[in-house]
């Protein structure tokens, strides 16, 4: 009768995380008697996975009925596999011994590889907003995948980006891996509606990559352009001065009118109009009674946008061009919230 052999027919087994791994093992003889044990790894630090003789192994079930007298199939199933279960598993036959059973023969081992899906990519942008023509960095992170091979791409509005750096950690063997990528993006004035997309492709995703997105509306600041104009209204001694605030983003904006350097009125942008590119326009105006002034008046429209230093545009009203009417009422009528009389 030939000596017992322990046969593990599968050199490797590949299982998706969350599924059940089947590790096959058969013996060629019923003797010597003694239990089968399964271990992960070899040597003194090996981990006991299953002991036919004793112990509680809730994740392990046997493929065949081990209580059958002539059973020589010692295959096991391990449920709810995670990347931490990866490793080489050995089916080891023990022979009876006193007081303890003695290791008799081991199978050649089966390498269990675990396919684990990457987590949904998380894209994060800079902490502070930046203006067009500036370059900003976006990061993309995904974790927990295995095997290590993975592909990451960046897109801006569907156009693939090339200026990025990617690292997969750790460099050596591990039960699972993480990817970290940083992309550089040059902002333009049209980027309010733009999106940056990080796309991760992995063998576990079966050709359906995972995507993480960041809206550039969270990153960009488009400073406004100002234009101050005047036109006469109602009577010869009244002038309507308007300040056109154009193409700004985000909406947070405060406007202050100055008369010869003195604050006349401050207001916050409320009823704005939105442009197709996502930027905003707003207009403020003053109704100026020029008859109340002996000298020229310098009107300044000063705008503080999104907490940035104020920008301004000035306009000179030529009082000499509008002769005063003697005895005229110096208290001009206030005709609206966006109108201001200069006394």
């Amino acid at each position: 009768e030939e000596e017992l052999q322990v046969i593990q027919p599968d050199k490797s087994v590949l299982v998706a995380a969350g599924e059940t791994a089947t590790l096959r093992c058969t013996a060629t003889s019923l003797i010597p008697v003694g239990p089968i044990q399964w271990f992960r790894g070899a040597g003194p630090g090996r981990e006991l996975i299953y002991n036919q003789k004793e112990g509680h192994f809730p994740r392990v079930t046997t493929v065949s009925d081990l209580t059958k007298r002539n059973n020589m199939d010692f295959s096991i199933r391990i449920g709810n596999i995670t990347p931490a279960d990866a490793g080489t598993y050995y089916c080891v036959k023990f022979r009876k011994g006193s007081p303890d059973d003695v290791e008799f023969k081991s199978g050649a081992g089966t390498e269990l590889s675990v396919r684990a899906k990457p987590s949904a990519p998380v894209v994060s942008g800079p902490a502070a907003r930046a203006t067009p023509q500036h370059t900003v960095s976006f990061t993309c992170e995904s974790h927990g995948f295995s095997p290590r091979d993975i592909t990451l791409k960046w897109f801006k509005n569907g156009n693939e980006l090339s200026d990025f750096q990617t690292n997969v950690d750790p460099v050596g063997e591990s039960v699972s891996y993480s990817i970290h990528s940083t992309a550089k993006v040059v902002l333009t004035r049209e980027d309010v509606h733009s999106q940056v997309i990080c796309e991760v492709a992995h063998v576990t995703l079966q050709g359906d990559p995972l995507r993480g997105t960041a809206n550039l509306s969270e990153t960009i600041r488009v400073p406004p352009t100002l234009e101050v104009t005047q036109q006469p209204v109602r009577a010869e001694n009244q002038v309507n001065v308007t300040c056109q605030v154009r193409k700004f983003y985000p909406q947070r904006l405060q406007l202050t009118w100055l008369e010869n350097g003195n604050v006349s009125r401050t207001e916050t942008a409320s009823t704005v109009t939105e442009n197709k590119d996502g930027t905003y326009n707003w207009m403020s105006w003053l109704l100026v009674n020029v008859s109340a002034h002996r000298d020229d008046v310098k009107l300044t429209c000063q705008v503080e946008h999104d907490g940035q230093p104020a920008v301004s545009k000035s306009h000179d009203l030529k009082v000499s061009a509008h002769p005063k009417e003697q005895g005229s009422n110096t208290a001009a009528e206030n005709t609206g919230s966006n109108e201001r009389n200069i006394y």
């Epitope: 009768e1 019923l30 003797i31 010597p32 008697v33 239990p35 036919q52 003789k53 004793e54 009925d65 081990l66 209580t67 059958k68 007298r69 002539n70 022979r95 009876k96 006193s98």
Partner: antibody
Framework: QVQLQQWGAGLLKPSETLSLTCAVY????????WSWIRQPPGKGLEWIGE???????NFNPSLKSRVTISVDTSKNQFSLKLRSVTAADTAVYYC????????????????WGQGTTVTVSS | SSELTQPPSVSVSPGQTASITCSGD??????VYWYQQKPGQSPVLVIY???RRPAGIPERFAGSASGNTATLTISGTQAMDEADYYC?????????FGGGTKLTVL
């Protein structure tokens, strides 16, 4: 404390069928094999066969063609039928539990019934 | 089919050590069990897994197995130990008994 109690006809004529039943009291029925053994007068022990709670059986090859062992888990009982008996089948018949212990293979017969004397005579 | 061979009889004086042998092919690779049977009684398991005693069996009963031989040793034999002793093992899926040894305490 597990006890086995057995009963059945003690006197048979040649060619009849021997029928014995063994009841298990005071312990688990599943997780064990249950055996039948016989001992002819003045001779040694001879194993007949075994069954477990799910009906899996093993038999002595020399008796297999005449033996049926069955189980009734609802009553914690198992039974032996030996067909076409002859005088050579005269013996004390024992039922026994095969200890499963911590290792389900190759265990001893740790609990025995009281024995039933079966005589085959014309 | 495996066969187990025992001496038909062994005699021992009270207080002495009795040894009963059981031989069979590759017995050392199998588990051996020993049973004691007194006249008119059912057998009792006295040794399992070669050398282990069930609860309630006196320490004077000991077993060993190696090669092709298993041995039941009763040290300090008492008159109450007089009985028939059977060795048993498994051959594949079947139980095999030895022919039995009658132990006489002189």
């Amino acid at each position: 404390q597990v006890q086995l109690q057995q009963w059945g006809a003690g006197l048979l004529k040649p060619s009849e069928t021997l029928s014995l039943t063994c009841a298990v009291y005071g312990g688990s029925f599943s997780g064990y094999y249950w055996s039948w053994i016989r001992q002819p007068p003045g001779k040694g022990l001879e194993w007949i066969g075994e069954i477990n709670h799910s009906g899996s059986t093993n038999f002595n090859p020399s008796l297999k063609s005449r033996v049926t062992i069955s189980v009734d888990t609802s009553k914690n009982q198992f039974s032996l039928k030996l067909r076409s008996v002859t005088a050579a089948d005269t013996a004390v018949y024992y039922c026994s539990r095969v200890d499963s212990g911590s290792y389900p293979y190759y265990d001893g017969l740790d609990v025995w019934g009281q024995g039933t004397t079966v005589t085959v005579s014309s | 089919s495996s066969e187990l061979t025992q001496p038909p009889s062994v005699s021992v004086s009270p207080g002495q050590t009795a040894s009963i042998t059981c031989s069979g092919d590759k017995l050392g690779d199998k588990y051996v069990y020993w049973y004691q049977q007194k006249p008119g009684q059912s057998p009792v398991l006295v040794i399992y897994h070669d050398d282990r005693r069930p609860a309630g069996i006196p320490e004077r009963f000991a077993g060993s197995a190696s090669g092709n031989t298993a041995t039941l040793t009763i040290s300090g034999t008492q008159a109450m130990d007089e009985a028939d002793y059977y060795c048993q093992t498994w051959d594949s899926s079947t139980v095999v008994f030895g022919g039995g040894t009658k132990l006489t305490v002189l």
